[in-house]
């Protein structure tokens, strides 16, 4: 009876369980009734980080200096290269594919702390009564306009991204 499932670190092919290739190696040929799975080590600047049946290894990530990147940890046959940013710059994502001097705070958020050489911009949501309608790396949330002090009334409520809209009071005839 041919197997329908295989053990861990094996795969099913042609009604047969074959061994997966270990990390750092790629598949050359599947096993047969008479031969083991054939695997080959990944080449220079290549890797595979799992037990696999891949026929091609992955290329190590390139830390492009034109994007402000440098190598934090050199890749091996089993691990990818880890990039980081030049000193004073910050990764734009966990994968660190590009660098920014500092991030900006989106509309609805204000700058709580301006970036320094060691820490990125810290943003905070604009609380009720405050707004920010811009992306900025220095502007705080601004208070809503006070219509009352201008002898006007609120015609449109403010949000975290928009100021209130003031208008003239309705005069009773």
């Amino acid at each position: 009876e041919p197997p329908t499932a295989c053990r861990e670190k094996q795969y099913l092919i042609n009604s047969q369980c074959c061994s997966l290739c270990q990390p750092g190696q790629k598949l050359v040929s599947d096993c047969t009734e008479f031969t083991e799975t054939e695997c080959l080590p990944c080449g220079e600047s290549e890797f595979l980080d799992t037990w696999n049946r891949e026929t091609h290894c992955h290329q190590h990530k390139y830390c492009d200096p034109n994007l402000g990147l440098r190598v934090q940890q050199k890749g091996t046959s089993e691990t990818d290269t880890i990039c980081t940013c030049e000193e004073g710059w910050h990764c734009t994502s966990e994968a660190c594919e590009s660098c920014v001097l500092h991030r900006s705070c989106s509309p609805g958020f204000g700058v709580k702390q301006i970036a320094t050489g060691v820490s990125d911009t810290i943003c905070e949501p604009c609380p009720v009564g405050f707004f920010s309608n811009v992306s900025s790396a220095f502007e705080k949330c601004h208070p809503w306009t006070s219509c009352e002090t201008k002898d006007l009334v609120v015609q449109q409520a403010g949000t975290n991204k928009t100021d209130v809209v003031c208008g003239p009071q309705d005069r009773l005839r």
Partner: nanobody, 116 residues
Framework: EVQLLESGGGLVQPGGSLRLSCAAS???????EMWWVRQAPGKGLERVS?????????YYADSVKGRFTISRDNSKNTLYLQMNSLRADDTAVYHC?????????WGQGTLVTVSS
């Protein structure tokens, strides 16, 4: 292609003044917050000053407050930094940069040397 070209640096005596310019091209200048950032020899990056797109709001680092003035001319696509009462510790390469502040927008900068 975004280009930021800084100019106006040079050698100046302590107490002197300089006006830096940054000519911008390849984007709609009037829509962007702009910054001046400096790097002293062997030191980290210091954020010096910033200005909002309309030129109505500004930021200054404590180290330059009262001495430096940032401004912009949106009709000329140019950012300025007027530096007065210069001190030896203002010696640095000055860069202008734009939101979103990515590395590719980083120009060569202009060197300011304050020395007697």
């Amino acid at each position: 292609e975004v280009q930021l070209l800084e100019s106006g640096g040079g050698l100046v005596q302590p107490g002197g003044s300089l006006r830096l310019s940054c000519a911008a091209s390849g984007f709609t200048f009037r829509d962007y917050e702009m910054w001046w950032v400096r790097q002293a020899p062997g030191k980290g990056l210091e954020r010096v000053s910033a200005i909002n797109p309309q030129g109505t709001r500004t930021y200054y680092a404590d180290s330059v407050k009262g001495r430096f003035t940032i401004s912009r001319d949106n009709s000329k696509n140019t950012l300025y930094l007027q530096m007065n009462s210069l001190r030896a510790d203002d010696t640095a390469v000055y860069h202008c940069t734009k939101l979103p502040f990515i590395f590719e927008y980083w120009g060569q900068g202009t060197l300011v040397t304050v020395s007697s």
